[in-house]
Every structure is written in structure tokens, then in C-alpha cells.
């Protein structure tokens, strides 16, 4: 198809001729992708580019964080005319190229998800040799990771005046709701903490007065499950007279 | 052209041990997972043990039923991948296909012609 | 584990005639539009033959009869015209979750 462009005064600008809409460099990311921890997510991302017929070198590359300057956890090359885009980044060996670059398709699998892969992700793709030219997405795909809640923490402390309290840690997304129980307590939402920055995914809830002796259970709950952990008080008393 | 050729395949009696190997040529033993498949006699196939390569630390992967029994490595030199098969049991009898998949894929693109392992008394 | 079950467990389809066989996962084996399902061929006293992988992926040198479907849990492929050489044992495979796990085989002869 033929695409002219004209000015305001009717003056023919430039007139381009391209053999296929896809003669221009774009990539295809979905805003958003969920998995539980512990399972495995595919980060789509297909480009097309101005190159026809393009079989020189390529490399292909993911990074996390940031666009251009977030750390690599992911980077192949295939030389020219092959199919093979041999593997020479993997971080800690959960990133795996499940696309074809020479197709266009640089999609990615991560496996054993963890909630410290809940970030944004980066495809791009470079070509070398007789045609230099790279792209990146701009906006990435978010990995959104889920989880059932785990307590990381629980412990008893002392505090001032002869007395303890009670801390309760729990991970999980969506953040999970942590309540106290025990002896004398009935069922506390005792003094929630939010998230701590930069641990988006931690709570933790404080029982600020441990007044009797006996088993304290702190219980995290979200919409993927429930977890249990319990610590027990037992002060010494000493003999009285 | 790619070649896949296993060996060591035999008679064993129960409780005994068994080395298989399988040798490869023809593509670029580095890139490349390898994995033991088997198939009991006039029955379905199995998957038993996969290998990662380098960049994916060696890593193995067993099939539960398997574990601590059997041992998949790889000798990149040598372009071979082995199963050390330990502790043998009747149900272990079947043809080990040793397999070839691409590091973004678990399917297996080329299969060897197998090797018979036989536990009897 | 995913359990895949084949159906039917033979077929017998005239030469020229459409072949289809069936697999189901025990849960699904796609992510983000990726499905996880591989089909091989198998003729007797020889190793399995990749056909198809990714669902609908034809592998190299594989003849254009074969085609693979589906999504989710359900996932088909078909023969268009049977040839006497398709006769064989056909299995379904999935690497959506360790341990990979085939289907029971489905044994494909002519009518």
C-alpha cells in the first residue's frame, strides 16, 4: 500500500511505499501477567520490525525493573540464518526463551515464581551484522505474583516493666490479614503494621501485652489460604514468703 | 545429522545396578537439555530424568516414583549424557530412550532407537 | 501430578479419511495463551516421532496432514487424509509442570 502525506498548504510531502504494515518497529506486551509462587508464568512479547527477511545475528533480552537500564535476568543469540537462539543469561537458571526471534515472538518462561519476581519486565531484541538496529518495549509486562500466606516470624519479646509482647511476621499477595489468639485475647486483629518498604509483600501485627501464661497463636489469612504459628509464655514464678 | 545412540541396556537381577550411556553427534551437545525416557514392554511411555545444560546449572529433575534410585549426568566433552540405575526393581524392565529438548521447551525433538533393560532373576 | 487421558484407545479410519484424536488434562496446561501439550508418533519397533509441540506447532519435516489444536484442558490432533504410513501409536505429553507425563497412547489403523 501506498501512504502519502500532505501538508497544509496541499504541498506532497513524502509518499512511502511499504509491502506490509508491519514495515516498522513495534512490540506486543500484555500490561499484566498473574501466577501463583511456586508455579510458572510466560511474559508474552512478539515485535515486528522494518528489517524484511532479516537473518543476520540477533540477540534477544529481558531485563527487569526498568527499560534500558534494569539488570538482565534474561539473554540468547543465534547466529546468522539459524533458529537456535542459544541461551547465555539465565538468573538462577528460571528464565527460558519459549519464542522463536527469528519468528518475531521473544515470549519467556519463569519458572518457580517467587513474590520477589512481583516486578515489571523488558523484551528487546538487537540485530547485528549487515543491518544494526534494536528495540525495547517501553512499558514492560508486569508479573503480578501471588501467594498463600507463610509466616516468616514469630516470637516473643521482652518490654519495659517485666513484661512481653508478641510479633507476628506473614507474607503473601494479596497481603495477608494477621490475627492474635490465646489466653484471655478471644480473636485480636492486634496492632497491624503496614508493609514495610521495599517488603511490599511482609505484615506484621505486634501484641503489645502478654498478661497470661499459655500458648499464643498468630494466624495469617488471604484469598489463597491460611497459615498457623503459635509461641508460648511461660513465666517463672518464684516462690512466694 | 543428528545421532542419538544409547547402550548398556542388559539383564540384571533385582537389586542390582546399571550404567546406560548415550552418545550423541551432530549438534552442539551444550545447548541442549537431555532426558531418559522409557516404555515398558506393549505399554505407554514414561519420563524419567531430565538434565539442564551450563547456563542452567546442570540441573536434574527426576520423576517422583524414581528419585534416589536413579542418576542422570552429562559429560559435555564427550557429548554423552548416563543414567546410573540403581537398586532395580521388575517395573524397571522397558526400553530407556535417551531424548534431546531445546532449553525453551520440555518435548523431545530427537529420540535414539533405545536400549533394553531386562530385570529378572 | 497432570494426568492426560487419550481418547479413544484405537481407531480405525479409511485410507484418504480424517483421523482425530482426542487429549484431556486433569488441569489446564496453557499460560498466557502458551499450551503446553506435545504429540508424537510411534510405529512399531521404532522410537516416538515429534509432530507436533506447543499445541498447534508442526516440527520440521513433519507433512501437513498432521495439525494440532485446542486449549485449556482439551487439545486434539488430526490427521486430514490417512496414509498407510500413519499407521502407528500416537501419545499426547505435556511440560506445563514437572513431571512430564504422556497420555495412554492411541493406536490409529486403516479400515
Known amino acids: 500500500f501506498v501512504r502519502t502525506k500532505i501538508d497544509t498548504t496541499e504541498n506532497l510531502l513524502n509518499t512511502e511505499v511499504h509491502s506490509s504494515p508491519a514495515q516498522r518497529w513495534s512490540m506486543q506486551v500484555p500490561p499484566e501477567v498473574s501466577a501463583e509462587a511456586g508455579d510458572a508464568a510466560v511474559l508474552p512479547c512478539t515485535f515486528t520490525h522494518p528489517h524484511r527477511h532479516y537473518d543476520g545475528p540477533l540477540t534477544a533480552i529481558w531485563r527487569a525493573g526498568e527499560p534500558y537500564a534494569g539488570p538482565q535476568v534474561f539473554r540468547c543469540a543465534a547466529a546468522r540464518g539459524s533458529e537456535l537462539c542459544q541461551t547465555a543469561l539465565s538468573l538462577h537458571g528460571r528464565f527460558r526463551l519459549l519464542g522463536n526471534p527469528r519468528r518475531n515472538d521473544l515470549s519467556l518462561r519463569v519458572e518457580r515464581l517467587a513474590l520477589a519476581d512481583d516486578r515489571r519486565y523488558f523484551c528487546r531484541v538487537e540485530f547485528a551484522g549487515d543491518v544494526h538496529d534494536r528495540y525495547e518495549s517501553r512499558h514492560g509486562v508486569r508479573l503480578h505474583v501471588t501467594a498463600a500466606p507463610r509466616i516468616v516470624n514469630i516470637s516473643v519479646l521482652p518490654s519495659p516493666a517485666h513484661a512481653f509482647r508478641a510479633l507476628c511476621t506473614a507474607e503473601g499477595e494479596p497481603p495477608p490479614a494477621l490475627a492474635w489468639s490465646g489466653p484471655a485475647l478471644g480473636n485480636s486483629l492486634a496492632a497491624v503494621r503496614s508493609p514495610r518498604e521495599g517488603h511490599g509483600h511482609l505484615v506484621t501485627a505486634e501484641l503489645p501485652a502478654l498478661t497470661h501464661d499459655g500458648r499464643y497463636t498468630c494466624t495469617a489469612a488471604n484469598s489463597l489460604g491460611r497459615s498457623e504459628a503459635s509461641v508460648y509464655l511461660f513465666r517463672f514464678h518464684g516462690a512466694s514468703g | 545429522e543428528v545421532q542419538v545412540v544409547e547402550s548398556g541396556g542388559g539383564l540384571v537381577q533385582p537389586g542390582g545396578s546399571l550404567r546406560l550411556s548415550c552418545a550423541t553427534s551432530?549438534?552442539?551437545?551444550?545447548?541442549?537439555?537431555m532426558n531418559w525416557v522409557r516404555q515398558a514392554p506393549g505399554k505407554g511411555l514414561e519420563w524419567v530424568a531430565q538434565?539442564?545444560?551450563?547456563?542452567?546449572?546442570?540441573?536434574?529433575f527426576y520423576a517422583e516414583s524414581l528419585e534416589g534410585r536413579f542418576t542422570i549426568s552429562r559429560d559435555n566433552s564427550k557429548s554423552t549424557v548416563y543414567l546410573q540405575m540403581n537398586s532395580l526393581r521388575a517395573e524397571d524392565t522397558a526400553v530407556y530412550y535417551c531424548?534431546?529438548?531445546?532449553?525453551?521447551?520440555?518435548?523431545?525433538?530427537?529420540w535414539g532407537q533405545g536400549t533394553l533393560v531386562t530385570v529378572s532373576s | 501430578d497432570i494426568v492426560l487421558t487419550q481418547s479413544p484407545d484405537s481407531l480405525a479410519v479409511s485410507l484418504g479419511e480424517r483421523a482425530t484424536i482426542n487429549c484431556r488434562a486433569s488441569?489446564?496446561?496453557?499460560?498466557?495463551?502458551?499450551?503446553?501439550i506435545h504429540w508424537y508418533q510411534q510405529k512399531p519397533g521404532q522410537p516416538p516421532k515429534l509432530l507436533i509441540y506447543?499445541?498447534?506447532n508442526l516440527a520440521s519435516g513433519i507433512p501437513a496432514r498432521f495439525s494440532g489444536s485446542g486449549s485449556g484442558t482439551d487439545f486434539t490432533l488430526t490427521i486430514s487424509s490417512l496414509q498407510a504410513e500413519d499407521v502407528a501409536t500416537y501419545y499426547c505429553?505435556?511440560?506445563?509442570?514437572?513431571?512430564?507425563?504422556f497420555g495412554q497412547g492411541t493406536k490409529v489403523e486403516i479400515k
Open positions: 538434565i539442564r545444560n551450563k547456563i542452567y546449572t546442570y540441573a536434574t
Open positions: 488441569q489446564s496446561v496453557t499460560i498466557s495463551g502458551y499450551s503446553f
Open positions: 506447543r499445541a498447534s
Open positions: 531424548t534431546r529438548s531445546l532449553t525453551g521447551g520440555d518435548y523431545f525433538d530427537y
Open positions: 505429553q505435556q511440560s506445563r509442570k514437572s513431571p512430564w507425563t
Open positions: 551432530g549438534f552442539n551437545f551444550n545447548d541442549y537439555f
